[in-house]
């Protein structure tokens, strides 16, 4: 029995920050759970994590390579990501197991998230000669 | 059959770590359905919950030992590993693995313990 | 953390004697009608051996005269006919919420 998420195909950044919903086909405020984004079309790398219950507010990590912190209500993780690079652009995927009480729950693997940073190029107005 | 053998125990100085392995056999670490624990019975007592490892790679570690406790595992070698840092004489123990199933986190298999003494 | 604490500590008892094991939890380990608690037969030595799971179902090739009942906080473990291999110590685990913690044991000697 797996979860279902739903995640904006596409988010397209030109300020370096990015925020990441997923919203999941169960209550999480029922279990304890552990939420997590992964970056790479095989999930390669974990960019951010937290766990969280009904009792207490989850403290979100980052991966070294990223600055993260994250929020949830009772069916969606919202993961906000900055300072991000050109570099970061990739297909990212939200994941979610629920631990306990037991049984142990997961979600089915999402079409993901294309997060496209833009590059910043400085706009300098050429101005014609004067005749 | 599904089997645990646990390694790595014996003599540890105070103040040093210990690296036990949880060799599996009869079913895979990464495929979902089971995850596995390590626990830990001090001699004469009973049984303490160290922490445990989910299909996926997570973990979850007792609070009381989070700070020196990694529990990590290869695919490749289908072998779970238990990392204990900063030992003292009150770590010393009979370390088992033992297996739990998705449903009711039961523990249906245990490997046979490897000691682990800690004294100088 | 769920504390659990079995009664008796220790009993002595005769081959054929029916002998009941109690365990409480400090807060329920119930959730959507199921009990997450588990017993355990330890003998000198070995590891654990599962006995009962999920409150009162019985392990694969654990005998009959063994059975658990109960639910929310309390629970029993029951031996109908003690035979000579069952005298161990046993122990109760709650699973439904981390970290997962024992029962402090209860020894079942010979009389």
């Known amino acids: 029995n797996k979860i279902l998420v739903k995640q904006s195909p596409l988010l397209v950044v030109d300020s370096n920050e990015v925020s990441l919903s997923c919203r999941y086909s169960y209550n999480l405020l029922a279990k304890e759970f552990r939420a997590s984004l992964y970056k790479g079309v095989n999930s390669d790398v974990e960019v951010c994590v937290g766990n969280g219950n009904f009792t207490y507010q989850p403290q979100f990590r980052s991966n070294a390579e990223f600055n993260c912190d994250g929020d949830f209500d009772n069916e969606t993780v919202t993961f906000r990501l900055w300072n991000l690079h050109v570099n970061h652009t990739d297909i990212y995927f939200c994941k979610i197991e629920f631990m306990y009480p037991p049984p142990y729950l997961d979600n089915e693997r999402s079409n993901g998230t294309i997060i496209h940073i833009k590059e910043k190029h400085l706009c300098h107005t050429q101005s014609s000669p004067k005749l | 059959e599904v089997q645990l053998v646990e390694s790595g125990g014996g003599l540890v100085q105070p103040g040093g770590s210990l690296r036990l392995s949880c060799a599996a056999s009869g079913f895979s670490l990464s495929t979902s359905g089971v995850g596995v624990s390590w626990i830990r019975q001090a001699p004469g007592k009973g049984l303490e919950w160290i922490g445990e490892i989910y299909h996926s790679g997570s973990t979850y570690y007792s609070p009381s030992l989070k700070s020196r406790v990694t529990i990590s595992r290869d695919n490749s070698k289908n072998t779970l590993y238990l990392q204990l840092n900063s030992l003292r004489a009150e770590d010393t123990a009979v370390y088992y693995c033992?297996?739990?199933?998705?449903?009711?986190?039961?523990?249906?298999?245990w490997g046979q313990g490897t000691l682990v003494t800690v004294s100088s | 953390d769920i504390q659990l604490t079995q009664s008796p500590s220790s009993l002595s008892a005769s081959v054929g004697d029916r002998v009941t094991i109690t365990c409480r939890a400090s807060?329920?380990?119930?959730?959507?009608?199921?009990?997450?608690l588990h017993w355990y037969q330890q003998k000198p030595g070995k590891a654990p051996k599962l006995l009962i799971y999920?409150?009162?179902s019985l392990q694969s090739g654990v005998p009959s005269r063994f059975s658990g009942s109960g639910s929310g906080t309390d629970f029993t473990l029951t031996i109908s006919s003690l035979q000579p291999e069952d005298f161990a110590t046993y122990y109760c685990q709650q699973s439904y919420r981390s970290p997962r913690t024992f029962g402090q044991g209860t020894k079942v000697e010979i009389k």
């Open positions: 999920a409150a009162s």
């Open positions: 807060q329920s380990v119930d959730f959507h009608g199921i009990s997450f």
């Open positions: 033992a297996r739990y199933g998705y449903y009711y986190y039961d523990f249906d298999y």
